[in-house]
Every structure is written in C-alpha cells, then in structure tokens.
C-alpha cells in the first residue's frame, strides 16, 4: 500500500523537515528558515512559534519541531503548551483585574498563583484552633476542646471579619 501510495503521490516521500514543492515539480524542498514540518508528506511548512515579550524560548524551533515557550520570570504558564502567561503574586495575595491584591481576612493563599481560600473551620471537625491563620497560611487545628486536659487551653479562634475587605497592609 505504501509503495502504491508513493507512486500515486510523490509528496508522500517527503520526510519531516521538508515540504512538497508544487512550484518545483513536487520536489521535496527543505523548510525555509523559521518554519518546520513535523510529519512527512506536507505541502507546506508551518511558521515557528515566536517566544517574545511575556514569553521566552524553552526550546528552539528546528526544521522538524516547533519552538516551545515558557514565561518570563514574574509570570507563569497557563493552558496547553504554555499558550498564555499570567502574572505571579506574592503569597498572601490573589490576582484580580486590578493586579495583585491581599487576601481578605479569613482567607489565605500559600502560593504565587491561584485564589485566596477560606481558612479551615476547625469547629466543623469538632476541633479547636491550635495556630491562627494568616494571609499566607491556613489555621492549624488541634485536638477537640474535650480532649484537652483540665487547665490546658487552646488558642482562641479568630474573631469573624466585621466586613468584607482586604486585610490591613
């Protein structure tokens, strides 16, 4: 079958890194600079991806494979094949359309990306707060109050936020 197909279609003989040039009697021509073909039998070469601005080159383009990009420091990749770059924030912040904003009281983010998440509610598991939460860290839950021996005490749970808003700077 392969032999039959190659007799019928001379382009099927063109390997990756070349294209079947109709202007030159279907001769296999090398891909021009800044282009590639990753499979054989192609009639055109694809333009190489350019990694510029928010993107930087992770792997150079070759005649047989596209360039691969990642993000310039200060940003991180999103999407398949790093199709987008998104701004990093500090721990204790989340990214909004207004830029990086501090987590509201009662929420935390321990990463440079993602959203602020509510502190764990220890009382739902019948436990007490051992270590208070911060903008950067979740609360640490301890044993339930009943498990504590007489005279021992746990850290008082944080007071609820009076109103929505960002933590004091």
């Amino acid at each position: 079958f392969e032999r039959t197909r190659s007799l019928q279609d001379p382009c099927s003989n063109c390997p990756a890194g070349t294209f079947c040039d109709n202007n030159r009697n279907q001769i296999c021509s090398p891909c021009p600079p800044n282009s590639f073909s990753s499979a054989g039998g192609q009639r055109t070469c694809d333009i190489c991806r350019q990694c510029k601005g928010v993107f930087r080159t992770r792997k150079e383009c070759s005649s047989t494979s596209n360039a691969e990009c990642d993000c310039t420091p200060g940003f991180h990749c999103l999407g398949a094949g790093c199709s987008m770059c998104e701004q990093d924030c500090k721990q204790g912040q989340e990214l909004t359309k207004k830029g990086c904003k501090d987590c509201c009281f009662g929420t935390f983010n321990d990463q440079k990306r993602g959203i602020c998440r509510p502190w764990t509610n220890c009382s739902l598991d019948g436990k007490s707060v051992l270590v208070n939460g911060t903008k950067e860290r979740d609360v640490v839950c301890g044993p339930s109050p009943a498990d504590l021996s007489p005279g021992a005490s746990s850290v008082t749970p944080p007071a609820p936020a009076r109103e929505p808003g960002h933590s004091p700077q």
């Epitope: 940003f75 999407g79 998104e86």
Partner: nanobody, 123 residues
C-alpha cells in the same frame, strides 16, 4: 498573523513625559482586554496597566497610579501609555500584551505580546 508592535520609547530626563503606542493587527482589537507590562534591567516582568474592550475600565500597578494613563483607539487598533513624571525606576522595556480569551473571567493570562520598546529615564 496576530501582531503587536510597540513604539515611542526613548531617553527622557526624570520628571519628563513619554507616550508609548502599540499597533495591533491580525485580530479584532476591540474584542480584547489589553495590557502594558515592563521589564527593568536584571528584573522580572511586572504588570503595569490594563484596559477593557471599550476603555471603561482601567487599572494600574500602585507604583504608576496618578502618573501613567492607559488608553485605546479601537478604530485605529491602537493601545497607548501616557507616562508623566517619569522616575529612574521606570526605566524598562515596555511590552504591549493581549489578554487571552476569557481574560477577567477565569484567568488573567496574556497570550500575545510584542518585541517591546525601551524607556530610559536618566539625567
């Protein structure tokens, strides 16, 4: 081909002004949020400002608030950054960047940016 081309950079004294431009082509400019980001020498990339599709929402990093103004002209497929009261710390390569599909809804990713234009603030 989707393209963004920045211009307008140069050498300016502290306290001076510059207006950066970004010419967009290959896509429907008026459908996208647009951004300016910058990279100071030896530093990481920093987001500077963004503007929504019709120009009714504009946001800035704290360090440029009251000094920089982002604007756009959808008829000309152009983005601008008016920079006043420039400081030495504004020295950087400035990039125009497009907010990807769904920007502001489920992400704040940038999917296309230009080669950049260099702004140097020095006496």
């Amino acid at each position: 081909e989707v393209q963004l081309v920045e211009s307008g950079g140069g050498l300016v004294q502290p306290g001076g002004s510059l207006r950066l431009s970004c010419a967009a082509s290959g896509f429907t400019f008026s459908n996208y949020w647009m951004n300016w980001v910058r990279q100071a020498p030896g530093k990481g990339l920093e987001w500077v400002a963004n503007i929504n599709q019709d120009g009714s929402e504009r946001y800035y990093v704290d360090s440029v608030k009251g000094r920089f103004t982002i604007s756009r002209d959808n008829a000309k497929s152009s983005l601008y950054l008016q920079m006043n009261s420039l400081r030495a710390e504004d020295t950087a390569v400035y990039f125009c960047a497009r907010g990807g599909e769904g920007y502001g809804i489920d992400h704040y990713g940038l999917d296309v940016s230009g080669q950049g234009t260099t702004v140097t603030v020095s006496s």
